[in-house]
Protein backbone atom coordinates (compact mmCIF):
# COMPACT_ATOMS: atom_id res chain seq x y z
CA UNK A 1 0.00 0.00 0.00
CA UNK A 2 2.82 2.38 0.97
CA UNK A 3 4.62 1.51 -2.27
CA UNK A 4 1.52 2.31 -4.34
CA UNK A 5 1.11 5.60 -2.48
CA UNK A 6 4.77 6.51 -2.94
CA UNK A 7 4.61 5.63 -6.62
CA UNK A 8 1.34 7.47 -7.16
CA UNK A 9 2.55 10.53 -5.29
CA UNK A 10 5.83 10.47 -7.22
CA UNK A 11 3.89 10.37 -10.46
CA UNK A 12 1.62 13.28 -9.47
CA UNK A 13 4.52 15.41 -8.18
CA UNK A 14 6.48 14.73 -11.37
CA UNK A 15 3.44 15.51 -13.51
CA UNK A 16 3.04 18.88 -11.78
CA UNK A 17 6.79 19.49 -12.12
CA UNK A 18 6.86 18.73 -15.82
CA UNK A 19 3.80 20.90 -16.42
CA UNK A 20 5.70 23.65 -14.62
CA UNK A 21 8.83 23.10 -16.73
CA UNK A 22 6.71 23.35 -19.89
CA UNK A 23 5.02 26.50 -18.55
CA UNK A 24 8.36 28.08 -17.61
CA UNK A 25 9.85 27.28 -21.02
CA UNK A 26 6.91 28.93 -22.77
CA UNK A 27 6.71 31.97 -20.46
CA UNK A 28 7.90 35.37 -21.69
CA UNK A 29 9.03 36.63 -18.32
CA UNK A 30 12.43 35.00 -17.91
CA UNK A 31 13.96 38.42 -17.42
CA UNK A 32 12.10 41.59 -16.57
CA UNK A 33 13.19 45.21 -16.67
CA UNK A 34 14.74 46.35 -13.42
CA UNK A 35 12.73 49.36 -12.25
CA UNK A 36 15.12 50.43 -9.49
CA UNK A 37 16.51 53.38 -11.46
CA UNK A 38 13.27 54.26 -13.25
CA UNK A 39 10.25 53.11 -11.24
CA UNK A 40 7.90 55.40 -13.17
CA UNK A 41 8.55 54.07 -16.65
CA UNK A 42 5.64 54.09 -19.08
CA UNK A 43 7.28 51.25 -21.02
CA UNK A 44 8.07 47.89 -19.43
CA UNK A 45 10.39 45.38 -21.10
CA UNK A 46 10.57 41.65 -20.46
CA UNK A 47 12.13 38.72 -22.28
CA UNK A 48 11.64 35.00 -22.65
CA UNK A 49 13.55 32.18 -24.33
CA UNK A 50 11.67 32.63 -27.57
CA UNK A 51 10.68 36.29 -27.79
CA UNK A 52 11.02 39.67 -26.13
CA UNK A 53 8.05 41.84 -25.19
CA UNK A 54 7.28 45.47 -24.43
CA UNK A 55 4.22 46.42 -22.41
CA UNK A 56 3.19 50.04 -22.68
CA UNK A 57 1.19 51.74 -19.95
CA UNK A 58 -1.59 52.20 -22.48
CA UNK A 59 -2.15 48.46 -22.18
CA UNK A 60 -0.66 47.63 -25.58
CA UNK A 61 1.84 44.76 -25.51
CA UNK A 62 4.13 44.00 -28.44
CA UNK A 63 6.14 40.80 -28.60
CA UNK A 64 8.81 39.96 -31.15
CA UNK A 65 10.18 36.48 -31.72
CA UNK A 66 13.89 35.83 -32.01
CA UNK A 67 13.81 34.98 -35.69
CA UNK A 68 17.46 34.02 -35.80
CA UNK A 69 19.32 30.99 -34.56
CA UNK A 70 22.90 31.93 -35.31
CA UNK A 71 22.57 35.46 -33.95
CA UNK A 72 21.47 34.38 -30.49
CA UNK A 73 23.89 34.07 -27.56
CA UNK A 74 25.27 30.56 -27.05
CA UNK A 75 24.09 30.63 -23.43
CA UNK A 76 20.49 31.25 -24.52
CA UNK A 77 20.73 28.35 -26.96
CA UNK A 78 22.11 26.17 -24.18
CA UNK A 79 19.24 27.12 -21.86
CA UNK A 80 16.72 26.34 -24.60
CA UNK A 81 18.37 22.96 -25.18
CA UNK A 82 18.40 22.10 -21.47
CA UNK A 83 14.72 22.99 -21.07
CA UNK A 84 13.68 21.04 -24.17
CA UNK A 85 15.71 17.99 -23.10
CA UNK A 86 14.07 18.29 -19.68
CA UNK A 87 10.60 18.39 -21.23
CA UNK A 88 11.27 15.48 -23.60
CA UNK A 89 12.75 13.27 -20.87
CA UNK A 90 9.94 14.24 -18.52
CA UNK A 91 7.29 13.45 -21.12
CA UNK A 92 8.84 10.04 -21.85
CA UNK A 93 9.15 9.44 -18.12
CA UNK A 94 5.46 10.23 -17.66
CA UNK A 95 4.52 7.85 -20.43
CA UNK A 96 6.63 5.06 -18.95
CA UNK A 97 5.42 5.73 -15.41
CA UNK A 98 1.75 5.49 -16.42
CA UNK A 99 2.30 1.87 -17.44
CA UNK A 100 4.42 1.30 -14.35
CA UNK A 101 1.73 2.40 -11.90
CA UNK A 102 0.84 -0.46 -9.56
CA UNK A 103 -2.80 0.58 -9.53
CA UNK A 104 -3.06 0.11 -13.30
CA UNK A 105 -3.20 -3.48 -14.64
CA UNK A 106 -1.96 -4.04 -18.16
CA UNK A 107 -2.41 -7.64 -19.21
CA UNK A 108 -0.49 -9.74 -16.75
CA UNK A 109 2.58 -7.53 -16.44
CA UNK A 110 4.94 -8.78 -13.78
CA UNK A 111 5.87 -6.68 -10.78
CA UNK A 112 9.49 -6.94 -11.86
CA UNK A 113 8.65 -5.27 -15.18
CA UNK A 114 6.72 -2.58 -13.32
CA UNK A 115 9.69 -2.11 -11.02
CA UNK A 116 11.93 -1.72 -14.07
CA UNK A 117 9.64 0.87 -15.60
CA UNK A 118 9.27 2.72 -12.30
CA UNK A 119 13.03 2.97 -11.93
CA UNK A 120 13.43 4.06 -15.55
CA UNK A 121 10.80 6.79 -15.21
CA UNK A 122 12.26 7.84 -11.86
CA UNK A 123 15.70 8.32 -13.37
CA UNK A 124 14.16 10.18 -16.29
CA UNK A 125 12.35 12.51 -13.91
CA UNK A 126 15.53 13.13 -11.95
CA UNK A 127 17.48 13.99 -15.11
CA UNK A 128 14.55 16.10 -16.38
CA UNK A 129 14.43 18.06 -13.13
CA UNK A 130 18.20 18.55 -13.15
CA UNK A 131 18.04 19.80 -16.76
CA UNK A 132 15.37 22.36 -15.83
CA UNK A 133 17.23 23.52 -12.71
CA UNK A 134 20.46 23.75 -14.70
CA UNK A 135 18.78 25.68 -17.52
CA UNK A 136 17.16 28.18 -15.19
CA UNK A 137 20.37 28.57 -13.17
CA UNK A 138 22.46 29.21 -16.27
CA UNK A 139 20.00 31.90 -17.35
CA UNK A 140 19.96 33.43 -13.86
CA UNK A 141 23.76 33.53 -13.84
CA UNK A 142 23.70 35.22 -17.25
CA UNK A 143 21.31 37.84 -15.89
CA UNK A 144 23.40 38.53 -12.80
CA UNK A 145 26.54 38.95 -14.92
CA UNK A 146 24.79 41.31 -17.37
CA UNK A 147 23.13 43.21 -14.52
CA UNK A 148 26.42 44.11 -12.86
CA UNK A 149 28.07 44.84 -16.18
CA UNK A 150 25.33 47.30 -17.11
CA UNK A 151 25.45 48.79 -13.61
CA UNK A 152 29.18 49.40 -14.05
CA UNK A 153 28.49 50.96 -17.46
CA UNK A 154 25.86 53.21 -15.92
CA UNK A 155 28.13 54.67 -13.32
CA UNK A 156 31.31 54.92 -15.38
CA UNK A 157 29.66 56.59 -18.33
CA UNK A 158 30.44 53.72 -20.68
CA UNK A 159 26.86 53.53 -21.88
CA UNK A 160 27.27 56.02 -24.70
CA UNK A 161 25.74 59.43 -24.20
CA UNK A 162 25.22 60.83 -20.74
CA UNK A 163 21.43 60.95 -21.04
CA UNK A 164 21.06 57.25 -21.86
CA UNK A 165 19.55 55.25 -19.03
CA UNK A 166 20.62 51.68 -19.70
CA UNK A 167 17.90 49.04 -19.44
CA UNK A 168 18.88 46.45 -16.84
CA UNK A 169 17.12 43.14 -16.46
CA UNK A 170 16.39 41.16 -13.32
CA UNK A 171 14.87 37.76 -12.52
CA UNK A 172 11.48 37.14 -14.10
CA UNK A 173 8.65 34.94 -12.83
CA UNK A 174 9.63 32.10 -15.19
CA UNK A 175 12.88 31.55 -13.31
CA UNK A 176 11.06 30.87 -10.07
CA UNK A 177 8.50 28.67 -11.83
CA UNK A 178 11.38 26.76 -13.44
CA UNK A 179 13.27 26.26 -10.19
CA UNK A 180 10.19 25.05 -8.33
CA UNK A 181 9.08 22.85 -11.23
CA UNK A 182 12.54 21.35 -11.62
CA UNK A 183 12.66 20.64 -7.90
CA UNK A 184 9.24 18.97 -7.97
CA UNK A 185 10.23 16.80 -10.93
CA UNK A 186 13.42 15.83 -9.12
CA UNK A 187 11.50 14.95 -5.93
CA UNK A 188 8.96 12.99 -7.98
CA UNK A 189 11.79 11.07 -9.62
CA UNK A 190 13.36 10.22 -6.28
CA UNK A 191 9.97 9.01 -5.02
CA UNK A 192 9.60 6.78 -8.08
CA UNK A 193 13.04 5.30 -7.46
CA UNK A 194 12.13 4.64 -3.83
CA UNK A 195 8.85 3.04 -4.94
CA UNK A 196 10.79 0.85 -7.36
CA UNK A 197 12.59 -0.87 -4.50
CA UNK A 198 9.29 -1.78 -2.90
CA UNK A 199 7.87 -3.04 -6.18
CA UNK A 200 10.66 -5.56 -6.77
CA UNK A 201 9.34 -8.96 -5.55
CA UNK A 202 11.12 -10.41 -2.53
CA UNK A 203 12.62 -13.93 -2.37
CA UNK A 204 9.61 -16.24 -2.24
CA UNK A 205 8.95 -19.96 -2.28
CA UNK A 206 7.61 -19.99 -5.80
CA UNK A 207 11.08 -19.39 -7.12
CA UNK A 208 12.18 -22.65 -5.59
CA UNK A 209 9.06 -24.36 -6.92
CA UNK A 210 9.86 -23.26 -10.46
CA UNK A 211 13.31 -24.87 -10.18
CA UNK A 212 12.41 -28.08 -8.37
CA UNK A 213 9.17 -28.98 -10.08
CA UNK A 214 8.96 -31.46 -12.93
CA UNK A 215 8.52 -30.64 -16.63
CA UNK A 216 5.03 -29.32 -15.95
CA UNK A 217 6.50 -26.55 -13.84
CA UNK A 218 5.42 -23.98 -16.42
CA UNK A 219 2.05 -23.97 -14.73
CA UNK A 220 3.64 -22.62 -11.56
CA UNK A 221 5.76 -19.97 -13.22
CA UNK A 222 4.76 -16.40 -12.65
CA UNK A 223 3.58 -14.96 -15.91
CA UNK A 224 1.75 -18.15 -16.94
CA UNK A 225 1.34 -18.47 -20.69
CA UNK A 226 3.88 -15.78 -21.39
CA UNK A 227 6.74 -18.20 -21.01
CA UNK A 228 5.83 -19.87 -24.28
CA UNK A 229 4.60 -16.82 -26.19
CA UNK A 230 7.84 -14.96 -26.56
CA UNK A 231 6.24 -12.06 -24.64
CA UNK A 232 7.74 -12.83 -21.33
CA UNK A 233 10.96 -14.03 -19.94
CA UNK A 234 13.28 -16.81 -20.76
CA UNK A 235 14.49 -17.96 -17.35
CA UNK A 236 18.01 -18.56 -18.49
CA UNK A 237 18.64 -14.92 -19.36
CA UNK A 238 16.41 -13.24 -16.82
CA UNK A 239 17.81 -12.01 -13.53
CA UNK A 240 14.45 -11.72 -11.80
CA UNK A 241 15.75 -10.39 -8.51
CA UNK A 242 18.78 -8.44 -9.59
CA UNK A 243 18.40 -5.23 -7.62
CA UNK A 244 16.17 -3.16 -9.84
CA UNK A 245 14.84 -6.31 -11.48
CA UNK A 246 16.02 -5.61 -15.01
CA UNK A 247 16.53 -8.16 -17.75
CA UNK A 248 20.04 -8.39 -19.13
CA UNK A 249 18.78 -6.89 -22.38
CA UNK A 250 17.43 -3.94 -20.46
CA UNK A 251 20.63 -3.58 -18.47
CA UNK A 252 22.55 -3.29 -21.72
CA UNK A 253 20.13 -1.02 -23.51
CA UNK A 254 19.24 1.21 -20.58
CA UNK A 255 22.22 3.59 -20.71
CA UNK A 256 21.63 4.22 -24.40
CA UNK A 257 18.45 6.08 -23.52
CA UNK A 258 20.67 8.76 -22.03
CA UNK A 259 23.49 8.75 -24.56
CA UNK A 260 22.38 12.02 -26.10
CA UNK A 261 21.53 13.93 -22.93
Amino acid sequence: MAVTACQGLGFVVSLIGIAGIIAATCMDQWSTQDLYNNPVTAVFNYQGLWRSCVRESSGFTECRGYFTLLGLPAMLQAVRALMIVGIVLGAIGLLVSIFALKCIRIGSMEDSAKANMTLTSGIMFIVSGLCAIAGVSVFANMLVTNFWMSTANMYTGMGGMVQTVQTRYTFGAALFVGWVAGGLTLIGGVMMCIACRGLAPEETNYKAVSYHASGHSVAYKPGGFKASTGFGSNTKNKKIYDGGARTEDEVQSYPSKHDYV
Epitope: Q33, V40, A42, V43, S58, G59, Q163
Partner: antibody, heavy 119, light 113 residues
Amino acid sequence: EVQLVESGGGLVQPGGSLRLSCAASGFTFSSFGMHWVRQAPGKGLEWVAYISSGSGSIYYADTVKGRFTLSRDNPKNSLYLQMNSLRAEDTAVYYCATSYYYGNALEYWGQGTTVTVSS
Amino acid sequence: DVVLTQSPDSLAVSLGERATINCKSSQSLFNVGNQKNYLTWYQQKPGQTPKLLIYWASTRKSGVPDRFSGSGSGTDFTLTISSLQAEDVAVYYCQNVYSYPLTFGGGTKVEIK
Protein backbone atom coordinates in the same frame (compact mmCIF):
# COMPACT_ATOMS: atom_id res chain seq x y z
CA GLU B 1 -17.48 55.95 -31.61
CA VAL B 2 -15.20 56.82 -28.71
CA GLN B 3 -16.52 59.67 -26.58
CA LEU B 4 -15.10 61.36 -23.49
CA VAL B 5 -17.23 63.97 -21.74
CA GLU B 6 -15.81 66.04 -18.89
CA SER B 7 -17.93 67.79 -16.27
CA GLY B 8 -17.62 69.41 -12.85
CA GLY B 9 -15.65 72.50 -13.80
CA GLY B 10 -16.52 75.94 -12.50
CA LEU B 11 -15.42 78.91 -10.43
CA VAL B 12 -13.80 78.19 -7.10
CA GLN B 13 -11.91 80.26 -4.53
CA PRO B 14 -8.22 79.64 -3.81
CA GLY B 15 -7.86 76.84 -1.27
CA GLY B 16 -11.19 75.39 -2.35
CA SER B 17 -12.00 71.98 -3.81
CA LEU B 18 -13.58 70.69 -6.97
CA ARG B 19 -14.29 67.26 -8.39
CA LEU B 20 -14.04 66.70 -12.12
CA SER B 21 -15.68 63.74 -13.83
CA CYS B 22 -15.11 62.13 -17.21
CA ALA B 23 -17.76 59.85 -18.67
CA ALA B 24 -16.42 57.42 -21.27
CA SER B 25 -18.27 55.50 -23.96
CA GLY B 26 -17.60 53.68 -27.23
CA PHE B 27 -14.71 51.56 -25.96
CA THR B 28 -13.88 49.06 -23.24
CA PHE B 29 -13.12 51.63 -20.53
CA SER B 30 -11.83 49.05 -18.04
CA SER B 31 -9.04 48.00 -20.43
CA PHE B 32 -7.32 51.33 -20.89
CA GLY B 33 -5.25 53.78 -18.91
CA MET B 34 -6.69 57.30 -18.56
CA HIS B 35 -5.05 60.72 -18.32
CA TRP B 36 -5.91 64.27 -17.34
CA VAL B 37 -4.20 67.06 -19.29
CA ARG B 38 -4.76 70.76 -18.71
CA GLN B 39 -4.19 73.95 -20.66
CA ALA B 40 -3.99 77.33 -18.96
CA PRO B 41 -5.44 80.26 -20.97
CA GLY B 42 -3.06 81.14 -23.80
CA LYS B 43 -0.52 78.56 -22.62
CA GLY B 44 0.65 75.12 -23.70
CA LEU B 45 -0.48 71.64 -22.72
CA GLU B 46 0.44 70.31 -19.29
CA TRP B 47 0.06 66.66 -18.36
CA VAL B 48 -1.62 66.32 -14.95
CA ALA B 49 -2.13 62.67 -14.00
CA TYR B 50 -2.50 59.09 -15.18
CA ILE B 51 -4.36 56.05 -13.84
CA SER B 52 -3.90 52.52 -15.16
CA SER B 53 -6.81 50.33 -16.26
CA GLY B 54 -7.15 48.57 -12.90
CA SER B 55 -6.07 51.58 -10.78
CA GLY B 56 -2.87 49.73 -9.88
CA SER B 57 -0.64 52.59 -11.04
CA ILE B 58 -1.39 56.27 -10.51
CA TYR B 59 1.07 59.02 -11.39
CA TYR B 60 0.86 62.79 -10.92
CA ALA B 61 2.72 65.83 -12.19
CA ASP B 62 4.90 67.39 -9.50
CA THR B 63 2.79 70.57 -9.60
CA VAL B 64 -0.35 68.74 -8.39
CA LYS B 65 1.12 65.94 -6.26
CA GLY B 66 -0.44 65.79 -2.81
CA ARG B 67 -3.33 68.06 -3.80
CA PHE B 68 -5.06 66.13 -6.59
CA THR B 69 -6.43 62.58 -6.34
CA LEU B 70 -7.23 60.50 -9.39
CA SER B 71 -9.67 57.58 -9.31
CA ARG B 72 -11.89 55.60 -11.62
CA ASP B 73 -15.05 53.54 -11.46
CA ASN B 74 -14.86 50.92 -14.21
CA PRO B 75 -18.44 49.61 -13.89
CA LYS B 76 -19.67 53.19 -14.34
CA ASN B 77 -17.16 53.97 -17.13
CA SER B 78 -16.13 57.04 -15.18
CA LEU B 79 -12.91 58.84 -14.31
CA TYR B 80 -12.62 61.32 -11.45
CA LEU B 81 -10.15 64.03 -10.47
CA GLN B 82 -10.54 65.33 -6.94
CA MET B 83 -8.80 68.72 -6.71
CA ASN B 84 -8.05 70.14 -3.27
CA SER B 85 -6.13 73.23 -2.09
CA LEU B 86 -6.69 74.88 -5.45
CA ARG B 87 -4.43 77.74 -6.52
CA ALA B 88 -4.76 80.48 -9.13
CA GLU B 89 -2.25 78.63 -11.34
CA ASP B 90 -4.64 75.65 -11.52
CA THR B 91 -6.95 77.76 -13.69
CA ALA B 92 -7.16 75.91 -16.99
CA VAL B 93 -9.25 73.82 -19.35
CA TYR B 94 -9.02 70.22 -18.10
CA TYR B 95 -9.12 67.45 -20.69
CA CYS B 96 -9.49 63.77 -20.03
CA ALA B 97 -7.73 61.59 -22.59
CA THR B 98 -7.07 57.92 -23.19
CA SER B 99 -3.98 56.01 -24.27
CA TYR B 100 -6.12 54.00 -26.65
CA TYR B 101 -3.39 53.86 -29.24
CA TYR B 102 0.08 52.36 -29.62
CA GLY B 103 3.12 54.08 -28.21
CA ASN B 104 1.28 55.45 -25.15
CA ALA B 105 -0.09 58.17 -27.42
CA LEU B 106 -3.19 60.05 -26.28
CA GLU B 107 -5.52 59.45 -29.17
CA TYR B 108 -8.92 60.36 -27.82
CA TRP B 109 -9.56 63.61 -25.97
CA GLY B 110 -12.66 65.07 -24.40
CA GLN B 111 -13.83 68.60 -25.17
CA GLY B 112 -12.59 69.82 -21.80
CA THR B 113 -14.09 71.47 -18.74
CA THR B 114 -13.00 74.89 -17.50
CA VAL B 115 -11.77 75.37 -13.95
CA THR B 116 -11.30 78.93 -12.73
CA VAL B 117 -9.61 79.57 -9.40
CA SER B 118 -10.17 83.15 -8.36
CA SER B 119 -11.19 85.19 -5.38
CA ASP C 1 11.73 64.52 -15.00
CA VAL C 2 12.15 64.61 -18.77
CA VAL C 3 12.33 68.18 -20.06
CA LEU C 4 11.32 68.74 -23.68
CA THR C 5 12.52 71.90 -25.40
CA GLN C 6 10.76 72.83 -28.64
CA SER C 7 12.19 75.21 -31.17
CA PRO C 8 11.30 77.59 -32.63
CA ASP C 9 8.47 79.01 -30.51
CA SER C 10 6.74 80.18 -33.67
CA LEU C 11 7.27 79.62 -37.34
CA ALA C 12 5.94 81.51 -40.39
CA VAL C 13 6.11 79.53 -43.63
CA SER C 14 4.74 80.19 -47.12
CA LEU C 15 2.04 77.89 -48.48
CA GLY C 16 3.60 74.86 -50.15
CA GLU C 17 6.89 75.36 -48.33
CA ARG C 18 8.54 73.03 -45.81
CA ALA C 19 8.08 73.61 -42.08
CA THR C 20 10.45 72.00 -39.59
CA ILE C 21 9.90 71.83 -35.83
CA ASN C 22 12.53 70.53 -33.43
CA CYS C 23 12.10 68.86 -30.06
CA LYS C 24 15.05 68.14 -27.77
CA SER C 25 14.77 65.87 -24.74
CA SER C 26 16.86 66.02 -21.58
CA GLN C 27 16.92 62.19 -21.51
CA SER C 28 16.90 59.52 -24.16
CA LEU C 29 13.41 58.38 -25.12
CA PHE C 30 14.71 55.32 -26.95
CA ASN C 31 13.54 51.95 -25.67
CA VAL C 32 16.02 49.15 -26.33
CA GLY C 33 13.34 46.46 -25.89
CA ASN C 34 11.51 47.25 -29.12
CA GLN C 35 13.93 49.73 -30.69
CA LYS C 36 11.35 52.50 -30.58
CA ASN C 37 11.44 56.12 -29.49
CA TYR C 38 8.66 57.12 -27.14
CA LEU C 39 7.92 60.59 -28.42
CA THR C 40 4.53 61.72 -29.70
CA TRP C 41 3.52 64.74 -31.79
CA TYR C 42 0.15 66.52 -31.49
CA GLN C 43 -1.56 69.25 -33.48
CA GLN C 44 -3.90 71.73 -31.82
CA LYS C 45 -5.85 74.03 -34.08
CA PRO C 46 -7.29 77.27 -32.62
CA GLY C 47 -10.31 76.56 -30.42
CA GLN C 48 -9.98 72.78 -30.82
CA THR C 49 -8.76 69.87 -28.74
CA PRO C 50 -5.32 68.38 -29.48
CA LYS C 51 -5.12 65.75 -32.20
CA LEU C 52 -2.61 62.91 -32.39
CA LEU C 53 -0.34 63.09 -35.44
CA ILE C 54 2.67 60.86 -34.86
CA TYR C 55 3.60 58.21 -32.29
CA TRP C 56 6.84 56.27 -31.76
CA ALA C 57 8.58 59.43 -33.07
CA SER C 58 8.05 58.52 -36.72
CA THR C 59 4.88 56.44 -37.14
CA ARG C 60 2.04 58.43 -38.65
CA LYS C 61 -1.41 57.79 -37.24
CA SER C 62 -3.84 56.46 -39.84
CA GLY C 63 -5.73 59.27 -41.50
CA VAL C 64 -2.96 61.83 -41.02
CA PRO C 65 -1.78 63.32 -44.37
CA ASP C 66 1.59 62.02 -45.53
CA ARG C 67 3.01 65.53 -45.70
CA PHE C 68 3.51 65.14 -41.94
CA SER C 69 6.56 63.13 -40.98
CA GLY C 70 8.51 62.55 -37.81
CA SER C 71 12.15 61.66 -37.43
CA GLY C 72 14.95 61.51 -34.90
CA SER C 73 16.11 59.18 -32.16
CA GLY C 74 17.29 59.28 -28.58
CA THR C 75 17.14 62.94 -27.59
CA ASP C 76 16.67 64.88 -30.83
CA PHE C 77 13.44 64.78 -32.80
CA THR C 78 11.92 66.62 -35.73
CA LEU C 79 8.42 67.11 -37.11
CA THR C 80 8.36 68.07 -40.77
CA ILE C 81 5.46 69.39 -42.81
CA SER C 82 6.74 68.88 -46.36
CA SER C 83 4.27 71.23 -48.06
CA LEU C 84 2.40 73.57 -45.74
CA GLN C 85 -1.36 73.87 -46.33
CA ALA C 86 -3.73 76.50 -44.93
CA GLU C 87 -5.36 73.89 -42.65
CA ASP C 88 -2.00 73.16 -41.03
CA VAL C 89 -2.04 76.45 -39.13
CA ALA C 90 -1.91 75.27 -35.53
CA VAL C 91 0.25 74.81 -32.46
CA TYR C 92 2.34 71.61 -32.50
CA TYR C 93 3.42 69.84 -29.33
CA CYS C 94 5.84 67.02 -28.71
CA GLN C 95 5.32 64.77 -25.68
CA ASN C 96 7.50 62.36 -23.75
CA VAL C 97 5.58 59.13 -23.32
CA TYR C 98 8.54 57.11 -22.06
CA SER C 99 8.49 57.88 -18.35
CA TYR C 100 6.23 59.65 -15.92
CA PRO C 101 5.46 62.50 -15.69
CA LEU C 102 4.53 62.51 -19.38
CA THR C 103 5.83 66.01 -20.08
CA PHE C 104 4.94 68.16 -23.10
CA GLY C 105 7.17 70.50 -25.03
CA GLY C 106 6.30 74.23 -24.91
CA GLY C 107 4.66 74.12 -28.33
CA THR C 108 5.48 75.65 -31.72
CA LYS C 109 2.99 77.93 -33.42
CA VAL C 110 2.94 77.48 -37.19
CA GLU C 111 1.54 80.37 -39.27
CA ILE C 112 1.37 81.23 -42.95
CA LYS C 113 3.82 83.85 -44.17
